[in-house]
């Protein structure tokens, strides 16, 4: 099964989950998936 | 109102590919990620895998992995899945759900897949 | 994660209470502390409807006979007075862990 890292930021908008990456240099802040339960799909 | 308009029905020989279509209105395509549902004869549901409409990226499930491709077109919000090298075990009804935060589905009318030579 | 579900078959009289099982081989709680335990009632020839979705919450529309509990690995679905429009195949299913899971349903049939 895959693996999923899952970073701490987080905001919900309309039920989805965007994920902002953190400590990723010049990615900081990046939406990198949204998310189903406890899955992200970037 | 969430709408989720599967294609119609596919009778194809062993060892064909055949790609389903699910066409999404009422809602932001690109906001929710869409996923697969298999249902052998009448039995239990089977997660295929999910795709996120913005990206393109995907997940499977291992067991589905080498057996389907998912994709969306965004100008025509639609997602599609394509099965490749088609037996009797793929026959089966397909679903085609919506996938929300709190992790429940909308579903598709169902799309049968009927594999016989 | 392997979801069980039992009874396989249920059969009820109009106006009784029925009550499902669904255990989950791990646990489905989240780090965030959600439970992504869910229910679905499907009718001949009809594709899966949300009837209760993160254990006890019930969908819009959803009428209050049904209700939901249970936590960790160990839920249970109750119709407090089955009505004949309940009728059909009820599935568990677990979206706290990929690959996402379903139980091998619930058959509620009249006695």
């Known amino acids: 099964d895959a693996e999923f890292r899952h970073d701490s930021g987080y905001e919900v908008h309309h039920q989805k989950l965007v994920f902002f990456a953190e400590d990723v240099g010049s990615n900081k802040g990046a939406i990198i998936g949204l998310m189903v339960g406890g899955v992200v799909i970037a | 109102e969430v709408q989720l308009q599967q294609s119609g029905p596919e009778l194809l020989k062993p060892g064909a590919s055949v790609k389903i279509s699910c066409k999404a209105s009422?809602?932001?395509?690109?906001?929710?990620?869409m996923h697969w549902m298999k249902q052998s004869h009448g039995k239990s549901l089977e997660w295929i895998g999910g795709?996120?409409?913005?990206?393109?990226?995907?997940i499977y499930n291992e067991k589905f992995k080498d057996k389907a491709t998912l994709t969306v077109d965004k100008s025509s919000r639609t997602a599609y899945m394509e099965l490749r090298s088609l037996t009797s075990e793929d026959s089966a009804v397909y679903f085609c759900?919506?996938?929300?935060?709190?992790?429940?589905?909308?579903w598709g009318q169902g799309t049968l897949v009927t594999v016989s030579a | 994660v392997v979801m069980t579900q039992t009874p396989l078959s249920l059969p009820v009289s109009l106006g009784d209470q029925a009550s499902i099982s669904c255990r989950s081989s791990?646990?489905?709680?989240?780090?965030?502390?959600?439970?992504?335990l869910h229910w679905y009632l499907q009718k001949p020839g009809q594709s899966p409807k949300l009837l209760i979705y993160?254990?006890?919450t019930r969908f819009s529309g959803v009428p209050d006979r049904f209700s939901g509990s249970g936590s960790g690995s160990d839920f249970t679905l109750k119709i407090s007075r089955v009505e004949a429009e309940d009728l059909g195949i009820y599935f568990c299913?677990?979206?706290?862990?990929?690959?996402?899971?379903f139980g091998s349903g619930t058959k509620l049939a009249i006695k």
């Open positions: 759900t919506r996938g929300v935060y709190d992790g429940y589905f909308y």
């Open positions: 009422g809602f932001t395509f690109t906001d929710y990620t």
């Open positions: 795709i996120n409409p913005n990206s393109g990226g995907t």
């Open positions: 791990q646990s489905l709680v989240y780090s965030n502390g959600n439970t992504f």
């Open positions: 993160k254990v006890s």
């Open positions: 299913s677990q979206t706290t862990h990929a690959p996402f899971t």
